[in-house]
């Protein structure tokens, strides 16, 4: 039985050109994490394999950095990066757990209503 839950760091609004961290955390299970995939819509961004380490998809190599931890850092954000991101935890013996984070990237000039945007 799958008892675990995925907690994410929550949806994010960020400025074009900035960078953000995407993180998920698997809790309430003793299952072993064998691999974590990061995807956007149907595109694979990166894989963190327990034995083989990190693999970043070639098309994202310039803008995606591994970590912190099993998370992912997206850099040089563009408006087209707006969308839903998935952390997919492959575990044994439980199976697959999926977390979802939405990212909205806004033009630098759009500081609507005094929103606080992230450029860590």
């Amino acid at each position: 039985m799958m008892t675990g839950t995925i907690e994410t760091t929550g949806n994010i609004s960020a400025e074009k050109g900035g960078s953000i961290i995407l993180q998920c955390h698997l809790s309430s299970t003793t299952a072993q994490v064998t691999q974590v995939n990061w995807e956007q819509q149907d595109q694979l961004l990166a894989i963190c394999n327990a034995d083989l380490g990190w693999h970043i998809s070639p098309s994202f190599k310039d803008r995606v950095a591994p970590g912190p931890g099993l998370g992912l850092t997206l850099q040089s954000l563009t408006v087209n990066d707006t969308g839903e991101y998935f952390c997919i935890y492959h575990t044994y013996p439980d199976g697959t757990y999926t977390g979802r984070i939405f990212l909205e990237v806004l033009e630098s000039s759009v500081a609507e209503h005094g929103a606080r945007f992230q450029i860590p």
Partner: antibody
């Protein structure tokens, strides 16, 4: 003035599918996310999902995956929601609502489209 | 999914009263950067929901200053300082920090 004009009420038979439209005016359609919300029994509000007009990306409430399909036509500044294989549980008022940039909420709403599923 | 619990379900008031509506979430609504996406709506019969408060405490344009929002983490409050006839209706909170977005069950503000 921001306006979201939704299509009119629908009476449909169980098992049928239908499409609700939401025509946006008074702002740049591709600059704002469009959300869809279901209101059942005149009370409960449920977020169905959203669509990003400029790249077509979507995010669904898993509860509505396979039930609702969101699309846009940028040339007419119109968002659409297809509702599939309708049952009496789908009888509700459906709203489109523009996203408030940077805040994960909705600022302007359509007037709602009433859908009744009955044989 | 994040569960959002609103209390009370019904709130009988007299005009001129000050009232508070509570909204609690099953997990923190602060994201990794400390931003909290919690908003409040008023839904009147025969109308569309109208945004009152976003980002915990920001009043949307045209919303009177008798409406105020506060809170943090999992605990949030909407205060209406002096109830007027046009304030009657259903109040909902909405969390947009976690996918999917989820609404509270609503609070009906009605005359005693």
């Amino acid at each position: 003035e921001v306006q979201l004009q939704q299509s009119g009420p629908e009476l449909v038979k169980p098992g049928a599918s239908m499409k609700i439209s939401c025509k946006a005016s008074g702002y740049s359609f591709t600059d704002y996310i469009m959300n869809w919300v279901k209101q059942s029994h005149g009370k409960n509000l449920e977020w169905i999902g959203l669509i990003i007009p400029y790249n077509g990306g979507t995010s669904y409430n898993q509860k509505f995956k396979g039930k609702a399909t969101l699309t846009v036509d940028k040339s007419s500044s119109t968002a659409y929601m297809d509702l599939l294989s309708l049952t009496s549980e789908d009888s509700a008022v459906y709203y489109c609502a523009r996203g408030l940039r940077g805040y994960y909420t909705m600022d302007y709403w359509g007037h709602g489209t009433s859908v009744t599923v009955s044989s | 999914d994040v569960v959002v619990t609103q209390t009370p379900l019904s709130l009988p008031v007299s005009f001129g009263d000050q009232v508070s509506i509570s909204c609690r979430s099953s997990q923190s609504l602060a994201n990794i950067y400390g931003n909290t996406y919690l908003s409040w709506y008023l839904h009147k019969p025969g109308q569309s929901p109208q945004l009152l408060i976003y980002g915990i405490s920001n009043r949307f344009s045209g919303v009177p200053d008798r409406f105020s929002g506060s809170g943090s983490g999992t605990d949030f409050t909407l205060k209406i300082s002096t109830i007027k006839p046009e304030d009657l209706g259903m109040y909902y909170c909405l969390q947009g920090t976690h996918q999917p977005w989820t609404f509270g069950g609503g609070t009906k503000l009605e005359i005693k």
